[in-house]
Interface confidence: low
């Protein structure tokens, strides 16, 4: 069961569930937000204060790291089987460090399986972070320090920081260095979403987040 | 040396289409963006369209959605600049220019020597 | 969308002047700007980018300055091969270009 479920089954308050993948025994520990948007969004990713590491190798991010509390990567494993089950939307809220709010918002998104590299794949997007897609399209493989599966001649994810779906290297990276503000522009390999910010602004705090598309 | 040599700028009427080509030499096309860039006779630069490497992603000026296709051959280094519903407004010297950038924008940093699109009945 | 905005739109100077070409953008681009060189006839030259980075080949006396919204390019001796029209360009977001300013014998 994902947050959709845990919200329809009366657990309307935002925090930490326990999900578990269909016809598995297999759990993991999510953040639920049930208030935005209609509530029931799993959340996928966060970073908000600097506080965890996503340097990390391609098994962290399979199998996920951090705290779901405050920031963490869910685990592509997880996620690829997910949104594999049924149609899942894909929102990701953004923040600056003036102030300033936006989303943009995938209406299909869905992982591929570790053996095709967790490769993304997003279609329909809406928004306010951007016309353009800031995860370039057609999607590409995950890549991580350890895993270079970018379109580079150089490493993406070792030149940027992160795991991410890395082009060459394209205009995003939510995985990236977190910097503080103040220290926030004229950084390459920060926490990136070109089509809102620009080459060098790094965000202050980002959250990705899925829920069934017939939520 | 990198060369950009532009092709096809013509007299057409309003209305009309014209394809525009960019031959590419001196370095490994299929690994820089590419872009048009055009001027109005006695005017400013204004980018027009870009493509990405692969020609998975094109980007125009609101102006021109809808008119204009931007596409290209790897295997040729070759650059194209596709004009339908042409209008006077779009009478100006066509550039071919590289982008430069290692992510999605960079600095134009070689540009052809352009050709000239007259539109006018 | 980012618009720039050149000034002056002519500047008349003399061989040897120090001159001083403004370029303002409508929002932060944090220094994601650059200065082309364009002669009559021909194609613009990309001179300096990321605000102050002079290009390969280009003469020292050119030279790129500021951030965030705010730039200035820079001759500190003009060479009759100077008196051209130069134009800033933004690609932080998209590229827009700033409409020029043309540097004219006096």
């Known amino acids: 069961r994902d947050c959709a479920e845990v919200f329809k089954s009366g657990h309307t308050t935002n925090g930490v569930y326990t999900l578990t993948l269909p016809n598995s025994t297999e759990e993991v520990k999510a953040y639920c937000d049930m208030e935005a948007g209609g509530g029931g969004w799993t959340i996928i990713q966060r970073r908000e204060d600097g506080s965890v590491d996503f340097q990390r190798t391609w098994k962290e991010y399979k199998v996920g790291f951090g705290n779901p509390s405050g920031e963490y990567w869910l685990g592509n494993e997880f996620v690829s089987q997910l949104t594999n089950q049924q149609r899942y939307v894909l929102k990701i809220h953004l923040k600056d460090w003036e102030g300033n709010e936006a989303y943009s918002l995938y209406e299909h998104f869905y992982l591929s399986s570790e053996e095709l590299n967790y490769r993304i794949h997003l279609k329909g997007l809406t928004g306010t972070a951007g016309k353009i897609s800031s995860i370039s399209q057609p999607g590409n493989d995950f890549s991580t320090k350890d895993a270079d599966n970018d379109k580079c001649i150089c490493k993406c994810s070792q030149m940027l920081t992160g795991g991410w779906w890395f082009d060459a290297c394209g205009p995003s990276n939510l995985n990236g260095m977190y910097y503080p503000q103040r220290q926030n522009t004229n950084k390459f390999n920060g926490i990136k979403w070109y089509y809102w910010k620009g080459s060098g602004y790094s965000l202050k705090g980002t959250t990705m987040m899925i829920r069934p598309a017939d939520f | 040396e990198v060369q950009l040599v532009e092709s096809g700028g013509d007299l057409v009427q309003p209305g009309g289409s014209l394809r525009l080509s960019c031959t590419a030499s001196g370095f490994t096309f299929s690994k820089y963006w590419m872009t048009w860039v055009r001027q109005a006779p006695g005017r400013g630069l204004e980018w027009v369209a870009n493509i990405k490497e692969d020609g998975n992603e094109k980007y125009f000026l609101d102006s021109v959605k809808g008119r204009f296709t931007i596409s290209r051959d790897n295997a040729k280094d070759l650059l194209f600049l596709q004009m339908n519903s042409l209008r006077g407004e779009d009478t100006a010297v066509y550039y071919c220019?590289?982008?430069?950038?290692?992510?999605?924008?960079?600095?134009?940093?070689?540009w052809g020597q352009g050709t000239l699109v007259t539109v006018s009945s | 969308d980012i618009q720039m905005t050149q000034s002056p739109s002519t500047l008349s100077a003399s061989v040897g002047d120090r001159v001083t070409v403004t370029c303002r953008a409508s929002?932060?681009?944090?220094?994601?700007l650059a200065w082309y060189q364009q002669k009559p006839g021909k194609a613009p030259k990309l001179l300096i980018s990321k605000a102050s980075s002079l290009e390969s080949g280009v003469p020292s006396r050119f030279s790129g300055s500021g951030s965030g919204t705010e730039f200035t390019l820079t001759i500190s001796s003009l060479q009759p091969d100077d008196f051209a029209t130069y134009y800033c360009?933004?690609?932080?977001?998209?590229?827009?270009f700033g409409q020029g300013t043309m540097v004219e014998i006096k």
């Open positions: 360009q933004q690609y932080n977001r998209y590229w827009t």
């Open positions: 929002q932060t681009i944090i220094n994601w």
């Open positions: 220019v590289r982008d430069r950038g290692i992510e999605v924008a960079g600095p134009f940093d070689y």
